[in-house]
């Protein structure tokens, strides 16, 4: 699987999961997130080889066709695959509230 | 929606579907398909700018953090959101056989 | 029941030749796209050479002008040439049968050694 589990341990040119730190303040200029101050949100990237962990028929048949056509455009894009959520603390005035947000997490990637 | 109703009838640079004529015999060297000789496969290809399209919470704040730091490497990329089957006909000697082979055409595209 | 057999691998020094093969078993061999994987420790199984089921056939950048990947249907049987190895073509060589109706297989592999 082209997991977090693989994918950080691995030099992996090919579509894997990459480590990215996300500062709320910094990075996105959110000032109303009180905790965490940032999150591994991570990402997807590297190309996607014929039969790489393909997601669809379709993403399989663009596989074969770009590693038999390699002048092509078309190819499979390394994306999410399995999410996780993420848990913040903010404030409606002094009032604290806690939220889950679906989704905010990479755990693996997959070619689509 | 980023579909072929729309993207085929638009010069659009940023992620849309993308017509596809994929020549069975030609273009995968598959000779055992008999109908049809090809198909509109499509493709998704295109930037993904901020909130467009975004497939989940993870890929809205990444596409913020693309938008914030230009520099990163790290952003949503353009792939198949609703596709579609397509139906075959091959022989198993002079038998004929008729499959429907599930998604296959892609109808829309989405950032992930 | 399906059966892929990779031989043919084993150690061989650098400059030197091995001739790889896959033979299928309980499936229609004409209608696969066949391949060669290969998987380095560590590694994720990479594309080595692939031959279509009408006899396409496309390289790794790395193996281009060294291997010659073959089919032969009268045998259900896929060949793997490989001239003037080198040191990082040793991994486990994984031979591979696609068709989009069905699923896809793979052999158990055959581990190829390059050293002096």
């Known amino acids: 699987a082209l997991d977090t589990n693989y994918c950080f341990r691995n030099l992996e040119e090919n579509c894997c999961v990459r480590p990215l730190y996300i500062d709320f303040r910094q990075d996105l200029g959110w000032k109303w997130v009180h905790e965490p101050k940032g999150y591994y949100a991570n990402f997807c990237s590297g190309p996607c080889p014929y039969l790489r962990s393909a997601d669809t028929t379709h993403s399989t048949v663009l596989g074969l066709y770009n590693t038999l056509n390699p002048e092509a455009s078309a190819s499979p894009c390394c994306v999410p695959q399995d999410l996780e959520p993420l848990t913040i603390l903010y404030y409606v005035g002094r009032t604290p509230k806690v939220e889950q947000l679906s989704n905010m997490v990479v755990k693996s990637c997959k070619c689509s | 929606a980023l579909d072929t109703n729309y993207c085929f009838r638009n010069l659009e640079e940023n992620c849309c579907v993308r017509p596809l004529y994929i020549d069975f015999r030609q273009d995968l060297g598959w000779k055992w398909v008999h109908e049809p000789k090809g198909y509109y496969a499509n493709f998704c290809s295109g930037p993904c700018p901020y909130l467009r399209s975004a497939d989940t919470t993870h890929s809205t704040v990444l596409g913020l953090y693309n938008t914030l730091n230009p520099e990163a490497s790290a952003s949503p990329c353009c792939v198949p959101q609703d596709l579609e089957p397509l139906t075959i006909l091959y022989y198993v000697g002079r038998t004929p056989k008729v499959e429907q082979l599930s998604n296959m055409v892609v109808k829309s595209c989405k950032c992930s | 029941q399906v059966q892929l057999v990779e031989s043919g691998g084993g150690l061989v020094q650098p400059g030197g030749s091995l001739r790889l093969s896959c033979a299928a078993s309980?499936?229609?061999?004409?209608?696969?796209?066949m391949g060669w994987f290969r998987q380095a420790p560590g590694k994720q199984r990479e594309l080595v050479a692939i031959?279509?089921?009408?006899?396409?056939?496309n390289y790794a950048d790395s193996v281009k002008g060294r291997f010659t990947i073959s089919r032969e249907t009268a045998k259900s049987t896929m060949y793997l040439q490989m001239n003037s190895l080198k040191s990082e073509d040793t991994g486990v060589y994984y031979c591979?049968?696609?068709?989009?109706?069905?699923?896809?297989?793979w052999g158990q592999g055959t581990q190829v050694t390059v050293a002096s």
């Open positions: 309980g499936i229609s061999f004409s209608y696969y796209d």
């Open positions: 591979n049968a696609h068709w989009i109706v069905t699923t896809d297989y």
């Open positions: 031959v279509t089921s009408g006899g396409r056939t």
